[in-house]
Amino acid sequence: CKAMHVAQPAVVLASSRGIASFVCEYASPGKATEVRVTVLRQADSQVTEVCAATYMMGNELTFLDDSICTGTSSGNQVNLTIQGLRAMDTGLYICKVELMYPPPYYLGIGNGTQIYVIDPEPCPDSDF
């Protein structure tokens, strides 16, 4: 396993609709055709997998139909969008990139993007 540098923004604020987007960029030293991108969430020293996609260089990422993630790829950049976020989902979201095939296998893990999610205030009832 060979190491690879992965860069991602330090902080992102989710929209009022619970959507957060960030770019995950990797310095590809190899000529991989198959790349796997995984988003991990770290909170309270617990790490869980949020979503993952395997894609062919030059093609679109395809997450599972029930995934909360969508994304596009351009060269060595992956534009990730996470939907359906709520305040309780605030945490550090780590981008993990693997150059799967052909060999050699490269693995890169970013420092993480702190995503802040603020639940919208409910609209007050109005009397007419």
Epitope: T54, M56, Y101
Partner: antibody, heavy 125, light 107 residues
Framework: EVQLVESGGGLVQPGGSLRLSCAAS????????MHWVRQAPGKGLEWVSY????????YYADSVKGRFTISRDNSKNTLYLQMNSLRAEDTAVYYC??????????????????WGQGTLVTVSS | DIQMTQSPSSLSASVGDRVTITCQAS??????LNWYQQKPGKAPKLLIY???NLETGVPSRFSGSGSGTDFTFTISSLQPEDIATYYC?????????FGQGTKVEIK
Amino acid sequence: EVQLVESGGGLVQPGGSLRLSCAASGFTVSSYYMHWVRQAPGKGLEWVSYISGSGSSTYYADSVKGRFTISRDNSKNTLYLQMNSLRAEDTAVYYCARDRMLVDSVNRVFGFDVWGQGTLVTVSS
Amino acid sequence: DIQMTQSPSSLSASVGDRVTITCQASQDISNYLNWYQQKPGKAPKLLIYDASNLETGVPSRFSGSGSGTDFTFTISSLQPEDIATYYCQQHTNFPFTFGQGTKVEIK
């Protein structure tokens, strides 16, 4: 027993089409990277194409790009090679082969460890 | 594309002889090189993977070495059943490419 069995070869006219099948037994094709390799009569081995375990990634030799399509049907545990616009120089024995590395394996060891018996494709008028 | 140059293209040796085949890659492929044996009318068989690792069930008289661009395949004591064509293959850049083959015959 781990086995690959090709079928679908035969005689076809230039410009015609054929679909080769490679049925796997003893293992699941979706767990491996799969390849097609061909060998023209009396010549050496030529790598043709590959497909990833997920099926999301494919690659082709320049000599067949745009004419050949690799695919798999996981429910049938079968690999395919759709060959269109065939030319005389496509005449060869076509082998399917399994890359020994499991798709999700931590042990990154490679090599075509299982091959089919081959199917002959003859392109001639 | 990475070119794989194998030599010699053919050789004739006596039973018990040490046989050496070389394979040169046009660029660095680290140790991502495999060696295959193909007997007439049969599919190729993997003998050596990652330049020097012997595939399970393959006799120990077969060995491989090398890294980067220069590789060697050796049969320490040639046996009658070793009559075949041997191919090297790089396994790190698409398209995967094979050497042109070395046909081994018995004198």
